[in-house]
């Protein structure tokens, strides 16, 4: 659930979401619209269409929870719980790393930006 | 070859704890991905998952009976223990311990080996 | 949790006949497994992951479905067929079983 990423998202990238993420450009954060503002925003957008299809698939995506190690900068989901959970781990890692593959671009400016100036196509999963 | 039996009280009264052991071979519980449940039937019915553990005494549960439930191991003397506390006549049944397949993809969660089960009579 | 409905709860089939055992599920699932078991003794493995049948099992049988819609397929009924079958998922947690099915034979 949303406990397993904050706590994934600050170990690989070694920042506090709650003040660096959650809400960070159009797409981190709940919910999400328009085009992304850049790649870490492009990270969290994916991340949303990972959890949409696990919604799809009838996981209860915020209330799942998965256990997982963290050792020498690398996630290893385990692979004892649900077919839900595992898949879930998987996609919280995923954003996770690309977050931490673009802490050089990230924008200050980017952080708690007003969804209303989220404009264009959002895009497709 | 692997084997595993069940043992218990046979029968008990209501509000007394029912202490059940599955005594296994052919496999160790120290072996990476290996795990054991704890399985019930009462008569002529369906299977209910009770508990589960794992090599690593990782332990999962039933969430409708959680409260009551304990799953340990010993792993040098090859055996799972499910403790039920409070027991009412609802839980009568035939107990099952089950190993969980060794699995090559990581999402399969079935019981490749059961043993022979044993009944749990609950008296009011 | 995942709530599995099998149908039918009780059948009966002839040598020979095709039978088709079918579980359903209160949402999407991954994949299904099935346990046979016959009076008396603990059940067993018989299908894994939807459609793989498990060590022993006689070719005669076959598992299929996905999403909430899943069966178990016997393509000419044997006397040895004559058993309960569950399945099972884990999908989410909790694990849950199946209520059974009994086949029975004509």
């Known amino acids: 659930g949303i406990l397993n990423l904050n706590k994934m998202v600050k170990q690989v990238t070694g920042k506090m979401p709650i003040l660096s993420y959650w809400p960070y450009g159009c797409h981190c954060g709940l919910g999400g619209r328009g085009q992304p503002k850049d790649a870490t925003d492009w990270c969290c957008q994916t991340h949303d269409c990972c959890y949409d299809h696990l919604k799809t698939q009838g996981c209860s995506i915020y209330k799942d929870y998965y256990r997982y190690n963290f050792s020498q900068g690398n996630i290893h989901c385990s692979d004892k719980g649900s077919w839900c959970e595992q898949q879930l781990c998987a996609c919280d890692k995923e954003v996770a790393f690309c977050l931490k593959r673009n802490l050089d671009t990230y924008q200050k400016r980017l952080r708690f930006y007003w969804r209303p100036h989220c404009r264009g196509q959002t895009p497709g999963c | 070859q692997v084997t595993l039996k069940e043992s218990g009280p046979g029968i008990l009264q209501s509000s007394q704890t029912l202490s059940l052991t599955c005594s296994f071979s052919g496999f160790s519980l120290s072996t990476s991905r290996m795990g054991v449940s704890w399985i019930r039937q009462p008569s002529r019915k369906g299977l209910e998952w009770l508990a589960h553990?794992?090599?690593?005494?990782?332990?999962r549960y039933n969430p409708s009976l959680k409260s009551r439930l304990t799953i340990s191991k010993d792993t040098s003397r090859n055996q799972v223990f499910l403790r039920i506390n409070n027991v009412d006549t609802a839980d009568t049944a035939t107990y099952y311990c089950?190993?969980?397949?060794?699995?090559?993809?990581?999402?399969?969660?079935?019981?490749?080996?059961w043993g022979t089960g044993t009944t749990v009579t609950v008296s009011s | 949790q995942i709530v599995l409905t099998q149908s039918p709860a009780i059948m009966s089939a002839f040598p020979g006949e095709k039978v088709t055992i079918s579980c359903s599920a209160s949402?999407?699932?991954?994949?299904m497994y099935w346990y046979q078991q016959k009076p008396g003794s603990s059940p067993k493995p018989w299908i894994y992951r939807t459609s793989n049948l498990a060590s022993g099992v006689p070719a005669r049988f076959s598992g299929s479905g996905s999403g909430t819609s899943y069966s178990l397929t016997i393509s000419s009924m044997e006397a040895e067929d004559a058993a309960t079958y569950y399945c099972q998922q884990y999908h989410t947690y909790p694990l849950t079983f199946g209520a059974g099915t009994k086949l029975e034979l004509k």
């Open positions: 553990i794992y090599w690593d005494d990782d332990k």
């Open positions: 089950a190993r969980r397949a060794l699995y090559d993809y990581g999402a399969d969660f079935y019981f490749d080996v």
């Open positions: 949402s999407s699932v991954s994949y």
